[in-house]
């Protein structure tokens, strides 16, 4: 069976890394495990990994925004940032604003790698399933 | 044969959903049908679906912009928004501006699903083939 | 073996097209050659091609930004722009700013095609491996 995941925003995320809806809606999870915000790889190989995060706020103050996909493995002491997007000076002060960050690329992943998504400012994330998501598939 | 599509912007249309060039240029269409703006799935399975839209204008007034990929199937009463990007407060009032929205993710699609792209303001879309496109491929 | 590449930003790029790190870090290069900034296709077929570029600056002057993936083949007289992103009026004058451009789509590539990435303003690109990259894989 094809190893694939597409997880969508979960609005009761209260800490980092982001947590994801893994059951309802347009979710996919096959041949990959989901555990505490992370996608757990169980077969070494090449994977296309992607994520989109939708940031929005009522009154722009241009707080720097970052969106990272990173990897953790108990063999390594430190998280590895695989992909990252940053935004600064992106809206007009005081105005209602909205913006997305999209990341996607190919990586060689190893069994037991855990993949996560991090954002700089959780309160500015909108978790609609069509707007904020995290996924991968094995090539 | 691999089921794949890459359609590019078609500028002489004023209708929603967006219509696409399905014949000339860097277009691909194999094992998938194109009908009235939509990509029609004829084999159930996992697909990576993507779209980019290039918005631009002569004088910024920060009109809210949205870019959606949605699915329609005669079995279901309502369209399903698969992916969406929104932008608000994205340019400096009165200036010439330009911005892109990119969407891409994996979905489990069913034979006879129709996929479309919608935008909130057609007048602000530039249809160059390298800038505005819609595609998918079966994993 | 799967034909795949993921190249990351190389900060000593001084000219166009962009040059890439093809050896160290989270780089992948298998069944595809890298030559003077370009990915060289050696087997005709369908490829998903992607790139992200991270632009940033100390003081916004809204210099128009462009990010292109283009193709060159000795059989054709002119470069073919496959995908392009443009940004204008994207930050507040005088402020420190940061923004990304992401491109990704499917193309039918031919043996000996050379793929490159071009940007309008090299001095505004940040080359961190997680932020600026260029890749592809054969479907």
């Amino acid at each position: 069976l094809r190893k694939v995941a597409h997880l969508t925003g979960k609005s009761n995320s209260r800490s980092m890394p982001l947590e994801w809806e893994d059951t309802y809606g347009i979710v996919l999870l096959s041949g990959v495990k989901y555990k505490k915000g992370g996608l757990v790889i169980n077969e070494t190989g090449l994977y296309f990994v992607y994520s989109k995060v939708y940031f929005r706020g009522q009154s722009c103050n241009n707080l720097p925004l970052s969106h990272k996909v990173y990897m953790r493995n108990s063999k390594y002491p430190q998280d590895l940032v695989m992909m990252e997007g940053k935004m600064m000076s992106y809206c007009t002060t005081g105005q209602m604003w909205a913006r997305s960050s999209y990341l996607g690329a190919v990586f060689n992943l190893t069994s037991a790698d855990h993949l996560y998504v991090n954002v700089s400012e959780l309160s500015l994330v909108n978790f609609e399933e069509s707007q904020t998501f995290f996924g991968l598939y094995k090539l | 044969l691999r089921k794949v599509a890459h359609l590019t912007g078609k500028s002489n249309s004023r209708s929603m959903p967006l219509e696409w060039e399905d014949t000339y240029g860097i277009v691909l269409l194999s094992g998938v049908k194109y009908k009235k703006g939509g990509l029609v799935i004829n084999e159930t399975g996992l697909y990576f679906v993507y779209s980019k839209v290039y918005f631009r204008g002569q004088s910024c007034n920060n009109l809210p912009l949205s870019h959606k990929v949605y699915m329609r199937n005669s079995k279901y009463p309502q369209d399903l928004v698969m992916m969406e990007g929104k932008m608000m407060s994205y340019c400096t009032t009165g200036q010439m501006w330009a911005r892109s929205s990119y969407l891409g993710a994996v979905f489990n699609l069913t034979s006879a699903d129709h996929l479309y792209v919608n935008v909130s303001e057609l007048s602000l879309v530039n249809f160059e083939e390298s800038q505005t496109f819609f595609g998918l491929y079966k994993l | 073996l799967r034909k795949v590449a993921h190249l990351t930003g190389k900060s000593n790029s001084r000219s166009m097209p962009l040059e890439w790190e093809d050896t160290y870090g989270i780089v992948l290069l298998s069944g595809v050659k890298y030559k003077k900034g370009g990915l060289v296709i050696n087997e005709t077929g369908l490829y998903f091609v992607y790139s992200k570029v991270y632009f940033r600056g100390q003081s916004c002057n809204n210099l128009p930004l462009s990010h292109k993936v283009y193709m060159r083949n000795s059989k054709y007289p002119q470069d073919l722009v496959m995908m392009e992103g443009k940004m204008m009026s994207y930050c507040t004058t005088g402020q420190m700013w940061a923004r990304s451009s992401y491109l990704g789509a499917v193309f039918n590539l031919t043996s000996a095609d050379h793929l490159y990435v071009n940007v309008s303003e090299l001095s505004l690109v940040n080359f961190e491996e997680s932020q600026t990259f260029f890749g592809l894989y054969k479907l």
Epitope: - | S11, N12, R14, S120, E121, L122, S123 | -
Partner: antibody, heavy 119, light 111 residues
Amino acid sequence: QVQLVQSGAEVKKPGSSVKVSCKASGYTFTRFDISWVRQAPGQGLEWMGWIFPGDGSSQYNENFKGRVTITADKSTSTAYMELSSLRSEDTAVYFCARSLISTAMFDHWGQGTLVTVSS
Amino acid sequence: EIVMTQSPATLSVSPGERATLSCRASKSVSTSDFSYIHWYQQKPGQAPRLLIYLASHLESGIPARFSGSGSGTEFTLTISSLQSEDFAVYYCQHSRELPRTFGQGTKVEIK
């Protein structure tokens, strides 16, 4: 900058036709609708119809019962509104306005053309 | 067709005061994304000028004392502190479907 310049005032007899022009500049003529809106003396605004110069498609307000025809000439970036079978109650200022296709608000207006229908 | 009803027909306000104009649609002009209502200002002998689009968005070049609100069928245009140049007729217009229709207008006059 965006400009819409209309033709001059007209005096017409009942039963005749009038054709008002609207020359656009400062933007891509084929990417926006041109709408026509009229205003009778001391009255409110009434939308008559639109044309999309990109493909020539048009839509009309049924209140005008086939009396109105809107056309566009891409080569000169000019839109035209022709109203036939004129009657005294058609005396009004006729405005052309650029409108965004989807949002359909009128963001730039011509200066107006007074059409007087009198015997 | 959707009928747009504005109230009051005339509003007498002193310079510096707040003005609140209402517009009611005979059926909803909102979707999940936007409310398709726009406000215009017209002065004698001039073409209308767009002030607010999609119920609450200020058009480029329009002073921040103008604001719009509402959804569904009830909409409001507010002028926070009337200036002499604001005395004019104001129209709402919907673009939810064809035909586009305008309200009959509210005249804001000096008290």
